[in-house]
Interface confidence: low
């Protein structure tokens, strides 16, 4: 049915879906706090611009009786049920914030008359790529894939003189929502990553992974996995690892590597960690003080979603344009707006751009050090440490195939 939008005459409402099934196990109260903090900032910015309007959020909760797995498995129906609730109440805001699960976002996008923008903290999967009115504020799988291909092909750095064309991918099905979709993208036979690699095998059992570490007949020296150091330790323990094995540990939403007192455990010496640049941490923020690093990124994406809406609202109001139009719904892309802790850039498809950081463990200091950074906005790698103190021979990353000479 046609739902009227509470989005005119100086009153602008944001519909926030508070779903029990979520990409990260974050208490809904924390997300509410993030949204409310965002609203305060937006009101201040609009007031400073001389725009005397009201901006509020309506939090839409599901009943939690049917969809209570807590993760994303039953999110498809929960998302549609919440939309039905909005439809029955005949009340929709100018913008929909949430859902975070790929399943629910994909289904909601398919099943709705999208004359309004949808902003998601999550929706990492490839199935949510290239959606005209969807904006994603946490790095989607496509961005990871582009980094990996870029890095695999790189062969002109002092520490990486070989192009790689092979990889193992460890994926055992117990991953968090972000990792699940990142690895899913790498596994998909039609994906850019698979297309660019000559050899790729998915390891699904712990034993398969453990055997590869010392297998002389392995087809690649490179193993991609997703999770934190503890996850790796549970799997690898203190097992011996062949000297030319390189483990790429994708752990994007984790600031712990940058903390001053962190020492890298010995089992991380064969590992390159891919994470996100920690941003403007010198500015201590009140809202993030009680959040763990991962949850901070999730709550921050909700907050930035509010700030993005405020940014677009300001532009449209200043230009005297209508908010309840397809033009507004399609405008949340190809722009940079003022986020909570610095600029946030969205690409042509509404996906957040970021600086990815590849870390290594220094054999001298046992500290994580930045090897290179990658700007997803320009698809460019910037080397940082030109003479890293690697565990690998000659302080260079090995070839991806044992015994193959220079290319």
């Amino acid at each position: 049915s046609q739902v009227s939008q509470n989005c005119h005459n100086g009153s602008y409402e944001i519909s926030v879906l508070m779903m029990g099934n979520s990409a990260f196990a974050e208490p809904l109260k924390n997300l509410e706090d993030a949204v409310n903090e965002g609203l305060e900032i937006v009101r201040g910015r609009l007031q400073n611009a001389g725009l005397n309007v009201t901006v509020n959020a309506t939090f839409m909760y599901s009943d939690g009786l049917i969809h209570n797995s807590g993760d994303c498995r039953s999110s498809t129906c929960e998302g549609l049920d919440l939309l039905r609730k909005i439809s029955n109440a005949q009340r929709m805001g100018c913008v929909l914030i949430g859902p975070s699960c790929t399943y629910s976002t994909f289904q909601m996008y398919l099943d709705t008359e999208l004359s309004y923008p949808m902003i998601s903290a999550g929706s990492f999967g490839l199935s949510c790529d290239y959606k005209e009115t969807l904006t994603r504020l946490m790095s989607p799988a496509r961005k990871l894939m582009y980094f990996l291909v870029n890095f695999w092909k790189t062969n002109d750095l002092p520490f990486k003189t070989y192009s790689w064309s092979t990889s193992y991918v460890y994926k055992n099905g117990t991953e968090t929502e972000d990792c699940f979709w990142y690895l899913n993208a790498l596994e998909a036979s039609v994906s850019y990553f698979s297309h660019e690699l000559g050899f790729k095998v998915v390891l699904r059992q712990d034993k398969e992974f453990q055997d590869i570490l010392m297998d002389h007949n392995r087809k690649s020296n490179v193993i991609i996995m997703c999770g934190g150091p503890e996850f790796l330790y549970k799997l690898k323990g203190d097992r011996a690892v062949a000297e030319d094995i390189v483990i790429i540990l994708v752990d994007l939403f984790n600031d712990q590597y940058f903390e001053d007192n962190v020492t890298a455990p010995d089992y991380m010496k064969n590992v390159l960690v891919l994470t996100l640049s920690p941003g403007n941490s010198l500015l201590n923020s009140s809202f993030s003080r009680n959040l763990s690093p991962t949850k901070r990124d999730f709550a921050l994406a909700y907050l930035n979603g509010i700030l993005l809406f405020g940014h677009m609202l300001k532009i449209f109001l200043e230009n005297g344009e209508n908010i309840t139009t397809p033009k507004f719904a399609h405008a949340f892309r190809n722009l940079t707006f003022e986020g909570y802790d610095g600029p946030v850039t969205l690409d042509d498809w509404g996906d957040v751009d970021s600086t990815m950081v590849l870390l290594y463990t220094s054999v001298d200091t046992k500290k994580y050090k930045v090897l290179l950074t990658y700007d997803t906005h320009v698809n460019k790698t910037y080397p940082v440490d030109m003479s890293p103190t690697f565990t690998w021979k000659n302080s260079k990353l090995p070839n991806d195939i044992t015994g193959r000479g220079p290319q």
């Epitope: 940058f258 640049s277 920690p278 941003g279 403007n280 610095g342 600029p343 850039t345 600086t355 950081v357 050090k369 930045v370 950074t373 700007d375 906005h377 320009v378 910037y382 940082v384 440490d385």
Partner: nanobody, 115 residues
Framework: QVQLVESGGGLVQPGGSLRLSCAAS????????MSWVRQAPGKGREWVAK????????YYVDSVKGRFTISRDNAKNSLYLQMNSLRAEDTAVYYC????????WGQGTTVTVSS
């Protein structure tokens, strides 16, 4: 390669002025916050000032407020620190830093305030 090169330090009398410069290269300078950090002899690094990517917000440590001014020129990929009313306790090696990565530091530029 990401590089930061500081210049402009020197010996100055108390009450005098200096202008430090930092030339940045190897990253998209105009998208990142920049900072000045200093390290006095025998002490740890101390954050001095920080400026937003477009120059619209600036933050200072209390001890330099009203005396130091941070600025930037994105067209030239340059960061500046204007230091007035210098005191003996401002003596230090001054470094510029970027939020692009915390692992890159220049060689620093030495400021000595002494009569």
């Amino acid at each position: 390669q990401v590089q930061l090169v500081e210049s402009g330090g020197g010996l100055v009398q108390p009450g005098g002025s200096l202008r430090l410069s930092c030339a940045a290269s190897g990253f998209n300078f105009g998208r990142y916050w920049m900072s000045w950090v200093r390290q006095a002899p025998g002490k740890g690094r101390e954050w001095v000032a920080k400026i937003k990517y477009d120059g619209s917000e600036k933050y200072y440590v209390d001890s330099v407020k009203g005396r130091f001014t941070i600025s930037r020129d994105n067209a030239k990929n340059s960061l500046y620190l204007q230091m007035n009313s210098l005191r003996a306790e401002d003596t230090a090696v001054y470094y510029c830093a970027t939020d692009f990565t915390r692992d890159v530091w220049g060689q620093g530029t030495t400021v000595t305030v002494s009569s």
